[in-house]
Amino acid sequence: NKILVKQSPMLVAYDNAVNLSCKYSYNLFSREFRASLHKGLDSAVEVCVVYGNYSQQLQVYSKTGFNCDGKLGNESVTFYLQNLYVNQTDIYFCKIEVMYPPPYLDNEKSNGTIIHVKGKHLCPSPLFPGPSKP
């Protein structure tokens, strides 16, 4: 028995930040779980982890240097990534694992979300136009 995960097909990070919502076919209320976000087609980089259990505050961390936060809904976890770089444009996959109560459950691999990180373009101000061409 596998949990199904829904993600937006694509998100654009205009200000080097993005909210990626992972929606599950499973209610996480009063469960011990590990929700994680993975980068790349092979999910090689674990970007962020949200750990939750019935008796403790939500714990969010990244072992790979990403600036991330997480919010919990009954059937969702939203990852908030900040300070993204243009070269971190990639496909990102949500993963959910329920550790307690038994049995252990995880998800069918989702289709993923392409996060397109747009660089900050500094447009010339109309008050100070660039040098005019001859």
């Epitope: 011990e32 779980f33 590990r34 982890v49 750990y51 939750g52 259990n53 714990q59 961390y61 072992k63 240097g65 694992e97 550790m99 307690y100 038994p102 252990y104 995880d106």
Partner: antibody, heavy 120, light 107 residues
Framework: QVQLVQSGAEVKKPGASVKVSCKAS????????IHWVRQAPGQGLEWIGC????????NYNEKFKDRATLTVDTSISTAYMELSRLRSDDTAVYFC?????????????WGQGTTVTVSS | DIQMTQSPSSLSASVGDRVTITCHAS???YVWLNWYQQKPGKAPKL??????NLHTGVPSRFSGSGSGTDFTLTISSLQPEDFATYYC????????TFCGGTKVEIK
Amino acid sequence: QVQLVQSGAEVKKPGASVKVSCKASGYTFTSYYIHWVRQAPGQGLEWIGCIYPGNVNTNYNEKFKDRATLTVDTSISTAYMELSRLRSDDTAVYFCTRSHYGLDWNFDVWGQGTTVTVSS
Amino acid sequence: DIQMTQSPSSLSASVGDRVTITCHASQNIYVWLNWYQQKPGKAPKLLIYKASNLHTGVPSRFSGSGSGTDFTLTISSLQPEDFATYYCQQGQTYPYTFCGGTKVEIK
């Protein structure tokens, strides 16, 4: 209280195999990895590998990948480490320890250690 | 694999001394560094996790600092029960690796 209790000392001949057990109690077995770490006489600590009892996924140190086998029996909250084709330099104390599956970075509880002596 | 190196490999100190042990990682491990104490014939005991967090029940004379590649364990005032071997361990990426250890002996 939280405990990891290991099986007793073993003496083996070169080429043989050894299987060490680690019985967990006092916590939810499927919330933690079980890791195996060894320490040769007078030497430092060497990580062998780990297993997660929830889905029995394993991670191995490349050095031990073809000789170590990690298993669990969740019905009795026990983990096992089998090391095959033993050599004299496998003589060591073997420890089991745990790390949290959701917050996995340190080893907070250790077994008492199992001495394995390999000698002809 | 991430290599962990510790210095010194051994040191002699007296009760009441301030003792500092350093640990170096071969690549950036952010704060994913733990410290353990081991006495002869016993299993290691966790002292510090995530570079600077004191594990439950560990005396406050132990402290840890650092991030990235360089880390420090400090014992502010050495007690008789602190004579032991100290190990650092990186928990950033598998395979988890330990340093060679520092043996703290009585002067």
